[in-house]
């Protein structure tokens, strides 16, 4: 059913009720548009900093990966660990911080065509959902081969961010993915998403643009832990 899918890892890393940010080369990700709750269009974010148990990387924040906390530790006990910075050892892409990927066992800087796995997944539409087209005709959402040669403009269907033109990333929109603008300075972003706050990742957002990272807005430090606003800010 839809609900079981929404609570599964098929649609993940989303503070209720909307979506997270698409994974990023180059900055901490702006996960959900903020964890958006109804109420005067106010943004509320949730950040939990305690060790978070996980089974796979996608259950962790975008600046974390899932692994045993100790070398050779019990593989059955895994938690979200801080991502590894450039030039640190790695075994897979997810271990490297946004903006890097794992090459020959070392985290190296990404170019525009390397993105973290979170939104690289091929999105399927077998969600027990009715996907009717507005004109009553069936419409394929897979990319034509032509799309791979012409970078997708805003609103184009995509599979990964490298399918999109510069300044855009591939992010979820309902049960498809489309090219959306990368976040600019001052726009709301969210970090440290936790499985407990997964929900409906339907309107996903892009990551913060180059030279920006997702941080707590200074005038929101005094706010309660459950409503701290993150925005894309200069490094």
């Amino acid at each position: 059913t839809l609900n079981s899918v929404l609570n599964s890892n098929a649609i993940k890393n989303l503070p209720p009720p909307l979506g997270g940010a698409a994974g990023h080369p180059g900055s901490a990700v702006s996960a959900a548009p903020g964890i958006l709750y109804p109420g005067g269009n106010k943004y509320q974010t949730i950040d939990n900093y305690q060790p978070y148990p996980c089974a796979e990387d996608e259950e962790c924040g975008t600046d974390e990966y899932c692994a045993s906390p100790t070398r050779g530790g019990d593989a059955g006990v895994q938690i979200c660990l801080a991502c590894r910075k450039r030039r640190k050892r790695c075994m897979r892409h997810a271990m490297c911080c946004p903006g890097n990927y794992c090459k020959n066992g070392i985290c190296v800087s990404s170019d525009q065509n390397h993105f973290r796995g979170e939104i690289e997944e091929t999105i399927t539409e077998s969600f027990g959902n009715d996907h009717s087209t507005l004109d009553g005709y069936s419409r394929r959402t897979t990319l034509s081969s032509k799309m791979y040669h012409t970078k997708g403009q805003e609103g184009s269907v995509c599979l990964r961010s490298s399918d999109c033109a510069s300044g855009l990333c591939c992010a979820r929109h309902f049960w498809s993915k489309i090219c959306k603008p990368v976040l600019k300075e001052g726009q709301v972003c969210t970090k440290h998403r936790r499985k407990g706050s997964h929900g409906l990742e339907i309107f996903q957002r892009c990551y913060c643009g180059e030279g920006l990272s997702c941080r707590i807005q200074k005038d929101h430090h005094q706010a309660s832990n459950s409503s701290r606003l993150h925005t894309c800010q200069r490094h």
Partner: nanobody, 117 residues
Framework: EVQLVESGGGLVRAGGSLRLSCAAS????????MGWFRHAPGKEREFVAG????????YYADSVKGRFTISGDNAKNTVYLQMNSLKPEDTAVYYC??????????WGQGTQVTVSS
């Protein structure tokens, strides 16, 4: 900043109908699509139906398929949810949300729908 205002909620008997409206104002960017969600006491917030202007598609939760119909007019910044054959389990606060091209997502304040048996 975009403001979303829902209306049309109310008290209705099981089997009855309601039509919810959601109007967006203050939009300076286009919207990719809009959706309806609901939140019943003691339950998780759930997706109900959505409409993608960008993809020309509508989406429904299994629980409302065949009973609810989403429609709208992107030019008028409005989305509707026609709810037929209502059941007591449809009782909830219904929220409208918008996927905006300015990279923000917005929520309305919600409208209460109560279905009595």
């Amino acid at each position: 900043e975009v403001q979303l205002v829902e209306s049309g909620g109310g008290l209705v008997r099981a089997g009855g109908s309601l039509r919810l409206s959601c109007a967006a104002s203050g939009r300076t960017f286009s919207s990719y699509g809009m959706g309806w969600f609901r939140h019943a006491p003691g339950k998780e917030r759930e997706f109900v139906a959505g409409i993608s202007w960008t993809l020309g598609r509508t989406y429904y939760a299994d629980s409302v398929k065949g009973r609810f119909t989403i429609s709208g007019d992107n030019a008028k910044n409005t989305v509707y949810l026609q709810m037929n054959s209502l059941k007591p389990e449809d009782t909830a606060v219904y929220y409208c949300a918008s996927d905006e091209s300015d990279a923000a997502n917005y929520w309305g304040q919600g409208t209460q729908v109560t279905v009595s048996s």
